[in-house]
């Protein structure tokens, strides 16, 4: 192009021909003058190449589809003219410079100049012939080439081709493969697959973080956020790709024989040019293991007879226990307890072991103890199980000194009540004061039914009637009568019999 | 003409430092994306890493990952590997080369060797 | 990493002789593209090595016509219609789908 000057100012350089383009046959004379008082050089450019000539005529005698390109000249004022040159040859259409990079969003040029700039259909065209992406749009430039419009991932290792029809005829370049490079729109995922460790000196700690990207180029590391002393940790990295643009990388870090010192909070880090994320792992170590039982609400238990309890204990253990075992009044082993590890705990070493007592009968209260252990230490808790009975009248007699006896047995410990009713009435109301009232030691053990004995002075009734014993607590409640007849003025019979009142 | 011309290899003791160049003649530097890949003495090729064109992308084999740092200066036409904390399994002929439009190594210069021994 | 097993790693041929070498990978190197990002080399006795097939089957240029390549996922094969003596190397396939991996090599001796 030669633009002209305004008067006054230097006049940018005259080339000959006289024209912004120029068509020459392959074989033919390229000859271009350039008419300045102050000229340089000439300069020629085309893809990667750019050649300088300090004569004003430049003459190319044997002209060749390379030699296509942008021709300069340049004044000592540092004004410039350009004129393009096409050197047209039936064997090369286009020129080619490889290789073809693109970034995800922007534009990329396929550079694939023309030689002949009197083509139809210059385009691009998939290598094998299959359709291109229908979202590829495209722009093409005779001198520089074929801009693909807004470059997508989807377009990564694309194999195209620019093509062109001459005289009716396609011709096409050598092949394209776009390589295309992610655009960060994200930062980096992170993960650890556990976010505390509990490990015994001497123990390996080994923690691995997967790092997730679209590409190679993320940054990531293992930090020791503590200030005490850097353990003696190694990282080891494996990496793949899960697809073009799916890339993992493992970050294992490793502490092989861990002291109390080494306990602290690990950092797993990364970060690319979008931002940067993290994940924290809690290292802690101890000098030995153990075994804490977390308090029970209550370890006094009662439960009504024939009815079902479970004993819960949860504890915490590192190393797991090795034992674990249920003791029925420190003698007798039962079943061993369903044990299981309370799984919303990430470092796993809270347990829980429940011992299921079905049906139980009276005779079935006592000391239940879970025992527990490890390679290191051992605890235990007990439970105190008692068993709530309905009373149960054992023995209701006249005894040789004129009282009627009652004798009842249950958990709580029974109360004895007695009432008396005449002939007449449906049910005993009138309360008869006991003279007597004794609590016997049913058992040994603590846990057993309570005997109660209570008795009254038969003597104190004056009419035919009926005496009730009944016998009650929590539970339930039992009765027993006495039925007796006055003749003269002696009693002439009394015969108990018993009335069990739900 | 066209070549690669590695140098800055040598014998090196564990836990050093070593800084190879890669200078390339004959073609646009600047278009193609560069490999280091080397080779242990009696042992076949193993990759390193690569640079892409324009210096943006980086990526290496995880052995050296975090050690060793590549990088270019287009002006000059020179590809670097900067390896820290040299061990004696990196002993090798380094050799660099450029990957062509279809990703295989089309171009390879002739190698440096870097011993790294106590 | 995508893992390259070369068979067999030693190769005595007479010359004149066709040989062959075997490659398989561990999963398969053939991209939604079409291409199998699979390329061999040959590494002359105290050479660099050269390029000699690149996506599979495709001759590198001043290779001559003798070599050529086939394959498709996960085996690939090499093959040298008619051995000469300066054939002689160490040939690798390399895998250039993911992050980049070489075989063992294959040393071909003349007998």
């Known amino acids: 192009s030669q633009p002209s000057a305004s008067p006054g100012e230097p006049s940018p350089p005259s080339i000959q021909p006289a024209q912004s383009e120029l068509i020459v046959e392959a074989g033919d004379t390229i000859r271009l003058t350039c008419t300045d008082p102050a000229f340089v050089k000439w300069t020629f450019e085309i893809l990667d190449v750019r050649i300088e000539n300090k004569q004003s005529e430049w003459i190319r005698e044997k002209a060749e589809a390379t030699h296509t390109g942008k021709y300069t000249c340049v004044s000592g004022s540092g004004l410039r003219s350009s004129i393009y040159v096409f050197v047209r040859d039936p064997a090369v259409l286009f020129l080619v410079g490889l290789p073809l990079f693109g970034k995800e969003d922007n534009d990329a040029l396929v550079r694939c100049p023309l030689t002949d700039p009197q083509v139809s259909n210059y385009s691009l065209i998939e290598c094998d012939g299959k359709s291109l992406p229908t979202d590829l749009k495209f722009v093409p430039n005779p001198k520089a080439g074929i801009t693909i419009k807004n470059v997508k991932r989807a377009y990564h290792r694309l194999c195209i081709r620019c093509a062109a029809q001459r005289e009716g005829k396609w011709m096409r370049s050598d092949k394209f493969t776009l390589k295309v490079r992610a655009a960060i729109k994200a930062i980096p995922v992170v993960s650890v697959p556990e976010t505390s460790h509990l490990l015994k000196e001497g123990d390996t700690f080994t923690v691995i973080c997967t790092i997730k990207d679209v590409s190679t180029s993320v940054d990531s590391m293992w930090i020791k956020l503590n200030p005490q002393p850097q353990s003696k940790a190694q990282v080891k990295r494996n990496s793949w790709h899960q697809g073009d643009f799916n890339y993992e990388r493992q970050e294992t870090l490793t502490i092989s024989s861990a002291r109390v010192n080494d306990s602290g909070v690990f950092m797993c880090y990364a970060n690319n040019t979008f931002g940067s994320a993290n994940v924290t792992t809690t290292l802690k170590v101890v000098e030995k293991g153990f075994i804490n039982i977390f308090p029970v609400k209550n370890t006094t238990v009662f439960v009504t007879d024939g009815e079902n309890v479970d004993l819960v204990v949860e504890f915490e253990a590192y190393p797991k226990p090795e034992h674990q075992q249920w003791i029925y009044m420190n003698r007798t082993p039962t079943n061993r307890g369903e044990d299981y590890v309370k799984s919303d705990n990430q470092s796993n070493i809270r347990y829980v072991n429940e011992l299921r007592l079905t049906r139980l009968k009276g005779t079935e209260g006592g000391t239940y103890t879970f025992l527990v252990s490890n390679s290191d230490v051992s605890a235990s808790v007990t439970f105190d199980v008692y068993v709530n009975t309905k009373p149960e009248i054992l023995t209701y007699d006249r005894l040789m000194n004129g009282r009627l006896q009652c004798v009842a047995a249950g958990f709580p410990e029974p109360t004895i009540d007695w009432y008396f009713c005449t002939g007449a009435e449906q049910r005993c109301t009138v309360p008869v004061p006991p003279v007597d009232v004794q609590i016997q030691n049913a058992s040994v053990s603590p846990f057993g039914k309570l005997v109660v004995q209570s008795s009254i002075d038969s003597s104190v009734f004056r009419h035919n009637g009926t005496v009730e014993c009944k016998a009650s607590n929590a539970v339930g409640k039992s009765s027993a009568f006495f039925n007796f007849a006055f003749k003269g003025n002696s009693k002439e019979q009394i015969q108990p019999h018993t009335l069990f009142t739900p | 003409q066209v070549q690669l011309v590695e140098s800055g290899g040598g014998v090196v003791q564990p836990g050093r430092s070593l800084r190879l160049s890669c200078a390339a003649s004959g073609f646009t530097f600047s278009r193609y994306g560069m490999h280091w890949v080397r080779q242990a003495p009696g042992k076949g090729l193993e990759w390193v890493a690569v640079i892409w064109y324009d210096g943006t992308n980086k990526d290496y084999t995880d052995s050296v990952r975090g050690r060793f740092t590549i990088s270019r200066d287009n002006s000059k036409n020179t590809l670097y590997l900067q390896m820290n904390s040299l061990r004696a399994e990196d002993t090798a002929v380094y050799y660099c080369?450029?990957?062509?439009?279809?990703?295989?190594?089309?171009?390879w210069g002739q190698g440096t060797t870097v011993t790294v021994s106590s | 990493d995508i893992v390259m097993t070369q068979s067999p790693l030693s190769l005595p041929v007479t010359p004149g002789e066709p040989a062959s070498i075997s490659c398989r990978s561990s999963?398969?190197?053939?991209?939604?593209?079409?291409?199998?990002?699979l390329d061999w080399y040959l590494q002359k006795p105290g050479q660099s090595p050269q390029l000699l097939i690149y996506?599979?089957?495709n001759r590198a240029s001043g290779v001559p016509d003798r070599f050529s390549g086939s394959g498709s996922g996960t085996d690939f094969t090499l093959k040298i219609s008619r051995v000469e003596a300066e054939d002689v190397g160490v040939y690798y396939c390399?895998?250039?789908?993911?992050?980049?991996?070489f075989g063992q090599g294959t040393r071909l001796e003349i007998k």
């Open positions: 999963q398969s190197l053939l991209h939604s593209n079409g291409y199998n990002y």
């Open positions: 996506l599979g089957s």
């Open positions: 080369a450029r990957e062509d439009w279809a990703e295989a190594f089309d171009m």
């Open positions: 390399m895998q250039a789908l993911q992050t980049i991996t």
